[in-house]
């Protein structure tokens, strides 16, 4: 009679053999869809995905027969643990299909969503290329606002109903898998159980993220204040000296990475540019060269070359008009030794570093390829994100850029170039941390049911102001879904990985630099050519998920938990410099200010006192009527006073700060032009002219429908109709 453990081993051997094939078919079909978005490829992907899901469901059921408490061998135990998780297969067939449809539809909307010029509907832009280009390079406040708003209006609004359903179905899946909600399910990736001294709970992750964020905050607040002062120079009169930063001015479509603000914020502009984009263009670099240089880096520390199949099968440039692809960079481990990258590479320093990041994923994938199928993954999701980032820390150093000919041989490092370098690094690394923390905190709260869906956007922008110090340039009501305007949200990726990875990458960098015998400050360390550092890293990579991440971390850095100290050490010289720069400015931000505040009019409505028992409820329909009434007043005013026929619509009356005791602010924009705010004085004149019509629409008078700052009309108070 064989033991339970032996039976489990036999079962897992069989599973590993069969899984390899089915997973490969599913991955290949998914790759084909991602590189060529067509209806046929969606169908093929779904069919292959269904087969894989059915197999997993069946195997998961069989895996339940092996009680974990009877398994001593950690490798066997971990595989069974992974397989006993049912994932989406716990849902009924119709719900599972619906969830799949939602995920595919969101992905397609995101990757094919277009924004068209209101004056020329034939002139349209995709996110990539097009809108991303504007958000990376434009210094025109209104052009940026157009791109920012249009993307959210076109794509975010389409995604809203789908995302609402997604939340419900994913929560149902998570609860059926014995998690509290889908956020808890995601946090499960960090959980370690039953390994003495190395256990880690899902709740611990929340605590660690919260307290490390508190430690990072002072550095971020000083970076924020410095950037605000520089943005005030670039966009005079658009930014408050004590306010949040307008969300559309921050270097990309989401304000996720501030890298592109470097040219506006460079501390010592007279020094040679350490953003080597121009040098890359001058030297005729292309996507192939970028990835070959990244490969050289990994090889120099003793890690393997990319496979021949990698070079043959990867899609490293935008296919352009030939076909539509998902352009967000991704690294693929399809199984059977087939590794690929999908990226619409542009010749920029940013993409040079992104190539290192993506190739880091592939190096990890290749390193743990010898592990059993179910343990081929990062020790946790943050580890997977950290590998390429470690390489990018070295690849970005002036020393390394000099060695590959992207900085001139006579480039001299001094205090000023050091501050330039560290500021550029901080724009990317420090600037993104509150963004990441806040986004995931919002999703965790949504999954937990702490934010009702009729307050998603309200809470999103409250948190964005409070935590990130960023404000919406125009108000967004609950028809929007701004979080889903980011790839990771609409494509169902957990996001806290980008926070944890940032802490890990500096912990790893510190340890690897010691292995490389680096002397001097951490930010000057370049581990290229150090096989000692490479070996130390590889020893961790090859473990995959076969050991608890806490142990894997301890093996490399000597500590079993995330620690923010190495990151703070790295940026210490910059922090000192920023404090000096900010000594005559306010550090921190008002959450009340918004770019549209000055042109807003406050409204107070008193239904109860005006109408008593006949008071009606103020709801979305009433607000629609209010906005329509103001649009009517605007049309009348422009026609009668200015002899202009301007077709204002209710969508041009933008409402913010709605309070339940019925007060709100509003302002008006020109039709089809969100950046053309009608001056408050003009709106006030229009209201005054149509005041009695507006009052009548709501059965109110000048006192119960109060426009603050607009003198009451001389018309008679509202008379109830004679019955």
């Amino acid at each position: 009679q064989s033991t339970i453990e032996e039976q489990a081993k036999t079962f897992l051997d069989k599973f590993n053999h069969e899984a390899e094939d089915l997973f490969y078919q599913s991955s290949l079909a998914s790759w084909n869809y991602n590189t060529n978005i067509t209806e046929e490829n969606v169908q093929n992907m779904n069919n292959a995905g269904d087969k894989w899901s059915a197999f997993l469901k069946e195997q998961s059921t069989l895996a339940q027969m092996y009680p974990l408490q009877e398994i001593q061998n950690l490798t066997v135990k971990l595989q069974l643990q992974a397989l006993q998780q049912n994932g989406s297969s716990v849902l009924s067939e119709d719900k599972s299909k619906r969830l799949n449809t939602i995920l595919n539809t969101m992905s397609t909307i995101y990757s094919t969503g277009k924004v068209c010029n209101p004056d020329n509907p034939q002139e349209c832009l995709l996110l990539e290329p097009g809108l991303n280009e504007i958000m990376a390079n434009s210094l025109d406040y209104n052009e940026r606002l157009w791109a920012w708003e249009s993307w959210r209006s076109e794509v975010g609004k389409q995604l809203r109903p789908l995302y609402e359903e997604y939340v419900v179905l994913k929560n149902e899946m998570a609860r059926a898998n014995h998690y509290e909600d889908y956020g808890d399910y995601w946090r499960g990736d960090y959980e370690v159980n039953g390994v003495d001294g190395y256990d880690y709970s899902r709740g611990q992750l929340i605590e660690d993220v919260e307290h490390t964020f508190e430690e990072i905050k002072p550095l971020y607040e000083h970076l924020h204040a410095y950037v605000r002062a520089k943005l005030m120079n670039a966009y005079p009169s658009y930014i408050s000296p004590i306010g949040c930063l307008p969300a559309h001015l921050l270097g990309d479509m989401w304000g996720r990475f501030w890298t592109n603000l470097y040219s506006l914020t460079v501390p010592f502009g007279q020094k040679p540019n350490i953003d080597v984009t121009d040098a890359m263009v001058d030297q005729a670099w292309d996507a192939q060269r970028i990835f070959k240089e990244a490969e050289k880096f990994f090889v120099s520390v003793g890690l393997p070359n990319m496979t021949q199949g990698f070079w043959e099968n990867s899609m490293l440039t935008d296919p352009g008009n030939v076909q539509k692809a998902v352009c967000h960079p991704t690294a693929w481990d399809l199984g059977k030794g087939d590794f690929r990258i999908l990226m619409c590479t542009k010749v920029t320093m940013d993409d040079f570093l992104t190539a290192h990041h993506e190739m880091g994923h592939i190096q990890y994938d290749m390193a743990y390829a010898a592990q059993p199928f179910l343990l081929r993954n990062g020790a946790n999701e943050g580890f997977h994100e950290a590998v390429g980032e470690i390489m990018s820390l070295s690849a970005a150093t002036p020393k390394h850029l000099k060695s590959i000919g992207l900085l001139s041989p006579d480039f001299q490092e001094d205090n000023e170039t050091e501050i330039n370098f560290l500021l550029k690094q901080a724009l990317t690394i420090v600037g993104t941390l509150p963004f990441t923390y806040m986004l995931e905190k919002w999703r965790w709260m949504v999954f937990k049911g702490e934010i009702p869906k009729d307050q998603w956007m309200k809470k999103w922008w409250e948190m964005k102001r409070e935590i990130v110090g960023v404000v919406e340039p125009v108000p967004h009501d609950e028809t929007y879904c701004d979080p889903a305007s980011l790839f990771h949200v609409s494509n169902d990726y957990s996001f806290i990985r980008y926070y944890t990875r940032t802490l890990y990458q500096f912990q790893f960098q510190e340890a690897l630099c010691q292995a490389a015998k680096h002397e001097g400050p951490l930010h000057k360390c370049d581990i290229s050519n150090s096989t000692e550092a490479g070996q130390k890293l590889f020893n961790m990579l090859r473990l995959g998920k076969s050991e608890p991440w806490t142990l894997a971390l301890e093996n490399v850095v000597g500590a079993k938990n995330m620690n923010v100290r190495p990151l703070l050490n790295y940026f210490e010289p910059l922090f000192t410099w920023l404090k000096d720069q900010n000594k005559n400015s306010f550090v921190g931000w008002s959450t009340d200010w918004s770019p549209y505040a000055d042109q807003s009019i406050k409204v107070r409505i008193s239904l109860k006192s005006a109408l008593g028992d006949k008071a009606y409820e103020w709801n979305d329909n009433e607000m629609y009527l209010f906005r329509s009434s103001v649009a009517y007043a605007m049309r009348q005013y422009f026609l009668k006073v200015k002899n202009q026929m301007i077709l204002f619509g209710e969508e041009d009356v933008r409402v913010a700060n709605l309070k339940p005791r019925i007060s709100f602010n509003f302002f008006v924009t020109a039709p089809k032009n969100v950046s053309d705010i009608i001056p408050r004085t003009e709106v006030e004149k229009a209201i005054r002219m149509s005041r009695s019509r507006i009052n009548d629409a709501f059965r109110l008078n000048d006192n119960s429908l109060e426009f603050l700052g607009i003198q009451p009309t001389l018309g008679p108070p509202n008379q109830p109709p004679v019955s």
Partner: nanobody, 120 residues
């Protein structure tokens, strides 16, 4: 000539309150916007609170949010800092400052400071 004179500091027990005043002359408060800063012994000067030129918006450092309130009385050309629930770590010299221009990032004139000591 621009002048800023702080007053209202003193010794107070933890949990107590103080109201600092900043009398401004040589410029109009309702045009510039003001800020309060503090410097504890052996530490760098740090932001405490600020108010916009029109008084519509206020901002506070995390460490004082919910406890301190900045305000201005334009008729008296005076700014105030109401400090409640004071803690020992609030001990510092408090300075008021005038913004260099209403919509600019920087402050150009500073008062001499008033000492606040929170101790039992």
């Amino acid at each position: 000539e621009v002048q800023l004179v702080e007053s209202g500091g003193g010794l107070v027990q933890p949990g107590g309150s103080l109201r600092l005043s900043c009398a401004a002359s040589g410029f109009s408060l309702d045009y510039y916007g003001m800020g309060w800063f503090r410097q504890a012994p052996g530490k760098e000067r740090e932001s405490v609170a600020a108010i916009s030129w029109n008084g519509d918006f206020t901002a506070y450092a995390d460490s004082v949010k919910g406890r301190f309130t900045i305000s201005a009385d334009n008729s008296k050309n005076t700014a105030y800092l109401q400090m409640n629930s004071l803690k020992p770590e609030d001990t510092a010299v408090y300075y008021c400052a005038k913004r260099a221009n209403p919509t600019g990032a920087y402050f150009d004139y500073w008062g001499q400071g008033t000492l606040v000591t929170v101790s039992s």
